[in-house]
């Protein structure tokens, strides 16, 4: 019967008595930076080319005995998970292995850097089809390793890495913390985060998604026909590398941004039990388990968006946090969140020729997060329209006045320490769909975009008194681009998008003794692209 | 024994290749920074990645590496260039004493220096 992990990543339409989705990634080359591997194992023979690259430190300990099967164990298993004949994800993918980890599974940042450079030079000398680089390793945060990954990603290479097995914030490790890398956490057959001894999978905002990573059957270097079960975020990353290879084989022109958005879009949503994660990390950790798309082509018509959380601002009065989208993505909205509720909103601003989302801490606050909604919108022309605080009137208003521009998000930023004492509602785009309305003491920022066939609408859901959280979701065929809260009182901790749902968090009414007049409303801006849908229909 | 001879050879070469023409000062206003792994047991002191500014050419990387060796040799330190990076990041990997970091950070074209550290199979 099909191993649990392959079943988990397979859409129902492919599920028969065996796993055999179409096109096994045959146009894609997957580079594996790991231990040495047993390349003639029956599972992977002829699929893995062992390069002559080797850069490893000496093994620790004077009595270390170099046993070939142990030296090859980790890499052989991962090669099998990516492209193994019987237990692999992308059975058609060809692989190239570089040895950067010694027989104890240990390597160096410098050896990994030289390995990445080797891949780049190979790519320049002999350009082939799409490249996926699998980095099933982790070290402490490294500026230089992250920088090298960024350069390789900008050269068109898809990098996939393990989140780490330290039951810790993945942002403290590299290459897991590199924004350009697809960082993968591990889940088990029950869709729970994987526990590994006293530790387990890493988590947090630097994780892009999770994938099967416990009791994964794959090639064993103990013998040429042996299989073994291994666990870890390396195994999870190998699944995503395989899925990426299959997606790229079906659509070789996909950019890294497009691939990442598709991986997120086709993942199983909200199946992970978040109670396993530390409380402060739950909101930051994506509740996504990787899966193959239901069909190899298509999906191009969809407006894809993802949520990007910033690092925490820190508690100082003037502290800010910035969330950035990838180079090929458009920032369509910006929101903020603070656990203490003390914040001064957020704004979209230009930085280095690109829009970023900046959130502002308030006096006495423990710090804020900026939350960017990053979308793939071809031929988009987006700008931010700002209205300074109106002060005298009932509220500040700003709208998208340019012909053909639609409102994709509203942000609000204020200098006063607490808007909670001022009653006028904040961020009410109701009435005129292309308008943001906010508090008279706040400056309001509207994200206005022109793109072929783009249409947007506002959806609201309010409840009489703060009850922890209010949500509103976009319906099928529409994509959430903006998420904000009404009103802007101190009860509201912030707003953020989770998949296609806008979540507004507020302090519990029982602890604040608030009255029903302080209702909380979640406001979603839902968009779709008729142009992308038509283009997709014409292709079919 | 073989390694020591290799280091000695590099030291001699470094002394011979010292050129007055290489003595331009680092650019004003930009201070190179030093980074190391926050997890102490994973640190590998004695090996450093010297990362140069983005547009630095290979020839400049090699020249900067030679200059570091020459200046270190004048102070009686042995250094060994293990690798010169180009293609992804400009820079070089050097085996040297941590005492030389201050000197290395002042070299022209240097953006930052990172102490090598361990990575592990996951």
């Amino acid at each position: 019967s099909i191993p649990w992990n392959l079943e988990r990543i397979t859409p129902p339409r492919y599920r028969a008595d065996e796993y055999q989705p179409p096109d096994g990634g045959s146009l894609v080359e997957v580079y594996l930076l790991d231990t040495s591997i047993q390349s003639d194992h029956r599972e992977i023979e002829g699929r893995v080319m062992v390069t002559d690259f080797e850069n490893v430190p000496e093994e620790d300990g004077t009595r270390f005995h170099r046993q070939a099967s142990k030296c090859d164990s980790h890499g052989t298993h991962l090669a099998g998970v990516v492209s193994g004949r019987d237990a692999g994800v992308a059975k058609g993918a060809s692989m190239r292995s570089l040895r950067v980890l010694n027989c104890q599974g240990k390597g160096t940042v410098s050896g990994t850097l030289i390995g990445l450079e080797f891949i780049r030079k190979s790519q320049l000398v002999q350009p082939v089809g799409p490249l996926v680089v699998l980095l099933p390793l982790a070290g402490g945060y490294s500026r230089v390793l992250n920088a090298a990954c960024q350069r390789l990603a900008r050269a068109g290479v898809v990098l996939v890495t393990a989140a780490g097995n330290f039951r810790d914030d993945a942002c403290l490790y590299s290459p897991a913390s590199a924004p350009e890398v697809i960082t993968v956490g591990a889940t088990n057959a029950q869709d729970q985060p994987v526990t590994l001894g006293t530790l387990g999978t890493n988590f947090g905002r630097c994780v892009d998604l999770f994938a099967p990573g416990e009791d994964i059957i794959g090639a064993s270097s103990d013998c040429s026909t042996c299989f073994v079960s291994q666990s870890g975020t390396s195994q999870a990353a190998a699944h995503v590398a395989g899925i990426a290879a299959m997606m790229l084989s079906a659509e070789p022109e996909l950019t890294l941004a497009e691939l990442r958005q598709r991986l997120i879009h086709f993942s199983a949503k909200d199946v992970i039990n978040e109670a396993w994660f530390p409380e402060d990390q739950r909101v930051l950790t994506p509740n996504l388990v990787a899966a193959l798309p239901p069909s190899t082509h298509g999906a191009g018509w969809q407006l894809f968006c993802r949520t990007v959380w910033s690092a925490h601002s820190g508690p100082t009065r003037m502290a800010t946090a910035i969330a950035r989208c990838a180079p090929d993505e458009e920032l369509l909205s910006c929101s903020s969140f603070s656990r203490s509720g003390k914040r001064r909103g957020e704004r979209m601003e230009a930085q280095g020729g690109k829009l970023v989302c900046r959130a502002h801490n308030a006096f006495g606050g423990e710090g804020v997060y900026a939350i960017a909604r990053c979308c793939l919108l071809p031929q988009a022309n987006c700008s931010v329209h700002t209205a300074p605080p109106a002060e005298a009137s009932m509220g500040t208003r700003v709208h998208c006045h340019q012909q053909g521009h639609v409102l994709t998000g509203c942000s609000s930023h204020w200098e006063v320490e607490d808007l909670g004492t001022h009653k006028p509602p904040v961020l009410r785009p109701r009435g005129q769909p292309n308008q943001c309305v906010g508090h008279r003491e706040a400056s309001i920022h509207a994200s206005c975009c022109h793109a072929p066939g783009l249409e947007c609408k506002v959806k609201e859901h309010g409840i009489p008194a703060p009850q922890g959280q209010v949500t509103v979701a976009c319906e099928e065929g529409w994509t959430l681009t903006g998420c904000s809260a009404l009103p802007g009182t101190s009860h509201v901790l912030g707003a953020y998008a989770v998949d296609n749902t806008c979540v507004v968090r507020s302090r519990d009414v029982s602890t604040t003794g608030s009255t029903s007049e302080e209702a909380v409303t979640a406001v979603a801006i839902c968009c779709r692209s008729r142009h992308l849908a038509q283009a997709s229909q014409e292709l079919q | 024994q073989e390694d020591e001879d290799g280091d000695y050879e590099e030291l001699v070469l470094a002394l011979r290749s010292e050129e007055d023409g290489l003595a331009e000062a680092p650019e004003h206003g930009t201070t190179a920074t030093f980074h190391r792994c926050a997890k102490d047991p994973w640190r590998l002191p004695g090996t450093y990645v010297v990362v140069l500014k983005e547009e630095t050419h290979l020839s400049q990387s090699e020249r900067t590496a030679r200059r570091l060796q020459a200046q270190a040799a004048r102070r009686g330190y042995l250094t060994k260039i293990l690798h010169v990076f180009h293609g992804l990041l400009p820079g070089f990997l050097v085996k040297m004493s941590g005492d030389l970091l201050e000197l290395a950070l002042k070299l022209p074209h240097v953006d930052y220096i990172e102490e090598d550290s361990s990575v592990f199979a996951q």
Partner: antibody, heavy 115, light 109 residues
Framework: QVQLVQSGAEVKKPGASVKVSCKAS????????ISWVRQAPGQGLEWMGW????????NYAQKVQGRVTMTTDTSTSTVYMELRSLRSDDTAVYYC????????WGQGTTVTVSS | QSALTQPASVSGSPGQSITISCTGT?????????VSWYQQHPGKPPKLMIY???NRPSGVSIRFSGSKSGNTASLTISGLQAEDEADYFC?????????FGGGTKLTVL
Amino acid sequence: QVQLVQSGAEVKKPGASVKVSCKASGYTLTSYGISWVRQAPGQGLEWMGWISFYNGNTNYAQKVQGRVTMTTDTSTSTVYMELRSLRSDDTAVYYCARGYGMDVWGQGTTVTVSS
Amino acid sequence: QSALTQPASVSGSPGQSITISCTGTSSDVGGYNSVSWYQQHPGKPPKLMIYEVSNRPSGVSIRFSGSKSGNTASLTISGLQAEDEADYFCSSYTSTSMVFGGGTKLTVL
């Protein structure tokens, strides 16, 4: 191109040993092992075992285990299959083939066991 | 006694399609994605025609196709030609070894 070239025909007496060679070329040797398959006259194919060019590990079929030894000489890219204590029913054409997938075959070596 | 069962012979006229079956167990054909088919002309070594159930090596005619259902694999040859007359063997992985079928003699009438 990928090629497996085998040694010439052998005639042996019962109880003797035979050693057949197979020289591989045209591909990365360590990416594949070598399988040995035999075919008795007018019969089907029988898999005898496999050897790794990468680390010399072997995997023998139960039927010949104890009588067969497969070895490699990486310097000449050659694999050897030695069969001991020959019997008349060992008379067959012996083939080497690339890997478990057996996608490329040698030309075959006829071994005749006769008193 | 071969581990995999094939019909001893099949025949067909030029232009017709024929199918050769290869039946095993869940420990071989049913348990692995690695069923291969070989063609062997008299006095020649076998030639790989299909690998991993349904994949064709380059150079093999698209008239040859493979499939699998449960513990039985099949080789189909469409548009039979005179040169297709040969012996055909299937093979499969087992947990630690390889097994072949007894072979099927294809006669093109």
